[in-house]
Amino acid sequence: SGVFQLQLQEFINERGVLASGRPCEPGCRTFFRVCLKHFQAVVSPGPCTFGTVSTPVLGTNSFAVRDDSSGGGRNPLQLPFNFTWPGTFSLIIEAWHAPGDDLRPEALPPDALISKIAIQGSLAVGQNWLLDEQTSTLTRLRYSYRVICSDNYYGDNCSRLCKKRNDHFGHYVCQPDGNLSCLPGWTGEYCQQPICLSGCHEQNGYCSKPAECLCRPGWQGRLCNECIPHNGCRHGTCSTPWQCTCDEGWGGLFCDQDLNYCTHHSPCKNGATCSNSGQRSYTCTCRPGYTGVDCELELSECDSNPCRNGGSCKDQEDGYHCLCPPGYYGLHCEHSTLSCADSPCFNGGSCRERNQGANYACECPPNFTGSNCEKKVDRCTSNPCANGGQCLNRGPSRMCRCRPGFTGTYCELHVSDCARNPCAHGGTCHDLENGLMCTCPAGFSGRRCEVRTSIDACASSPCFNRATCYTDLSTDTFVCNCPYGFVGSRCEFPVGLP
C-alpha cells in the first residue's frame, strides 16, 4: 500500500491556445486530469489501472502551481494504491480548458483539450522527487513525482505491513525494510521477551520486564544464584535448594546441635584445656592453682592442705608456710619428735613403732587419713564427677550430684530421653540437651510423629529429565530443579539451546 504523488509546478501556455490551435475565450482556464497505469512500452488510452485524479482550475494560460497539501491534498496530487508497487508505471497528464464550472468529462467539448503528455518508466519507492519537464509546440509543463509507502507499510515495494507497538505482544519499532527493531531491553522474534538483569541465573531466575531478576522457588539473591536452605537450618548451608549441610562442629537435621562446644563457647577459664565430650558437653582440665567446672576458681596454695600432722598453713606471696604443732617439724610438719608413747594417732588410729622406737606410723580407720589420722578423707579432691556434676562426701564414700541430662556414678552417662521410644509411627529419636526430637517418616508430623499428614510430594518422582526433586515442607508440594537445557515445573520441556 502506498501513494504515487505528483507535484505540478508550472504550466506555460503563452498564447492561450487549445491543442487544436484555437484560442481560449477570454483565456485558457486550465485544470488537469491525471491517469496512472501499469507500464506500457507505448502508452495507450485505456483503463487507468493504478488510479486517476483531477484538479480544480489552477490558473489561466501560464501560471505556477502553489504547494497546497492543506486543502485536501490538492498539490501534490495523491494517487493511492492498495497493492505491491511493481517498480514501473505509465503516466498520462492532460491539461484541459474549462469554459464553465462543470469539469466532468461528459460536460466538456472534445476540443477543450489543451495538451496531453505521456511518460513511462521505472520508479523505485523513495522520498526523493523526480523532476521532469515536457514541452509541446505551444505548451510546457514542469512537474515532479515520487512513490512513497502509506503509513505502516515498508519495503522496496511497500508490501510489508508493520505497526510499531509497545505492549505484551511486542516492544518494537519498524525498520525501513519492515523488519522489527526491538526497543531497548527486549528480544525475541516479536521483541516480546525481556532481557533480564545482567548475570541473572539462566535456569533459576527469570523476568517479566527488562533488567529484572525474579527467582524461581528455592533460589534467592540479586541474581537468583543462591539456594535457599531447609527451613529452620541454623548452622548450615546448601548447594541445591532445601538442603542443610552442617558447618563444622554442628550436627542434627537443622544443624542446630552443637558438637564443638569448646570452640564455639570457650567455656574453660584460666588457660584450662577444654575437651568436647558430646553434644553441648565438655570437660575442663585445670592448670595448677585453679578449680571449678570451668576452672573459674583460683586455688589458694593452702587449699591443698599441704601441712601434715595438724600443722596450720599460712599463705605467702611466694607460696605458703606450715606452722607445726609441738612434736613436729619439717617443711610440711612431716617429721615427728613423738613416739607411740605420746599417743600421736587421732580418731582411733593405731600406732606402730618404727626404727626401734625412734619413729612411728599411724594406721588410720576408714574415713581418716594423714600421718596422725587427723584428717577426714575428702574423696572429692580428685574432681571425679564429669559433665559439671557436683561431688558430695558421704561418710566412707563419695557421691556425684549430676546436672540435668546426665547420670551414672560419675555423671558420665548422657540420659537418653529416647530410651522409652517416644516417637510414634517409626519416627527416629534424637537426644538433645534439654529433651529429644523426633524425625518423622513420610506422611507423619508433630512433636512425636503422632499427626498423619500428606505423603512426601517427591515420593512419586514427578520430575523429568534427571531433575532433582525437593519437597517444600511448608506447602507439602515439590519443586523440580532442572538440569541445563530443560524448563517447566516438572522440567519436562527441552529448551532450544544455541
Epitope: L161, K163, R165, H168, E189, Y206, S208
Partner: antibody, heavy 121, light 107 residues
Framework: EVQLLESGGGLVQPGGSLRLSCAVS??????????WGWIRQAPGKGLEWIGD???????YYNPSLKSRVTISVDTSKNTFYLQMNSLRAEDTAVYYC?????????????WGQGTLVTVSS | EYVLTQSPGTLSLSPGERATLSCSGQ??????ASWYQQKPGQSPRLVIY???KRPSGIPDRFSGSNSGDDATLTISRLEPEDFAVFYC?????????FGQGTKVEIK
Amino acid sequence: EVQLLESGGGLVQPGGSLRLSCAVSGGSISSSSYYWGWIRQAPGKGLEWIGDIYYTGSTYYNPSLKSRVTISVDTSKNTFYLQMNSLRAEDTAVYYCARQALAMGGGSDKWGQGTLVTVSS
Amino acid sequence: EYVLTQSPGTLSLSPGERATLSCSGQRLGDKYASWYQQKPGQSPRLVIYEDSKRPSGIPDRFSGSNSGDDATLTISRLEPEDFAVFYCQAWDRDTGVFGQGTKVEIK
C-alpha cells in the same frame, strides 16, 4: 490440532468466587509464541476481554476487573486458570479461554467451547 | 479507556450481496485490527487478523482494511453460512478491546 477445554463453571452465590480451568491439548502451553487469555460474554451481550498470561507467569488484566481477577498457569498440567472474587450478578456470563498468537498481532486463533457461570442467590 | 464503535448495529442483506462492516476507534489505523465471527451458541472464530490477513480455512471472500480511524471488514458475496455477529478487536497498550458487534442477518 490444539484444543482448549474450560471447566469449573456453574452457580455461584453473590460475593463468592470462581476458579475456572482451561486445559490445553495438542500443543504445549510453554510455547513462547502464545499468550493464553480469558474472555467473557454476558447473555445477549458482546465480548469482554478479562486478561491473559504467558508461560513464564507474566499476567495482564483488564483494568476494570484487575482488583478481582487472578490468572495463573501450571505448565506441568498444560493448564491455565481464572480466579475471580467478590462476584456479582453482572458477572453472569459464558467464560471462554483462548489462545492469542504473537504471529497474528495478538489475534485469538483458538477458542474453548465456553463455560457458563451464573451468579445468583 | 479505549473504545471501538461498530456500525451499523445490524446489516440486513441477501445471499450474494456485498457486506461492509465498519469499526472506528481513535487512530485505529496505528493498531492491528482483528475480526471475529460468532454464530448463535458457538464460540467466536477469527476471520481477519493484522488488518487484512486471513487465517487458514477462511475463504477469500472475507477481506479487511484499516487506516486512519476506521477498520473495515468486507464480505464480497454473502453465503448462507456467513450470517452471524461480527466483532472487531484491537489492543490498546496491554488491554484487549472489542467492539459491540454488528449482526449480519438475512433480509
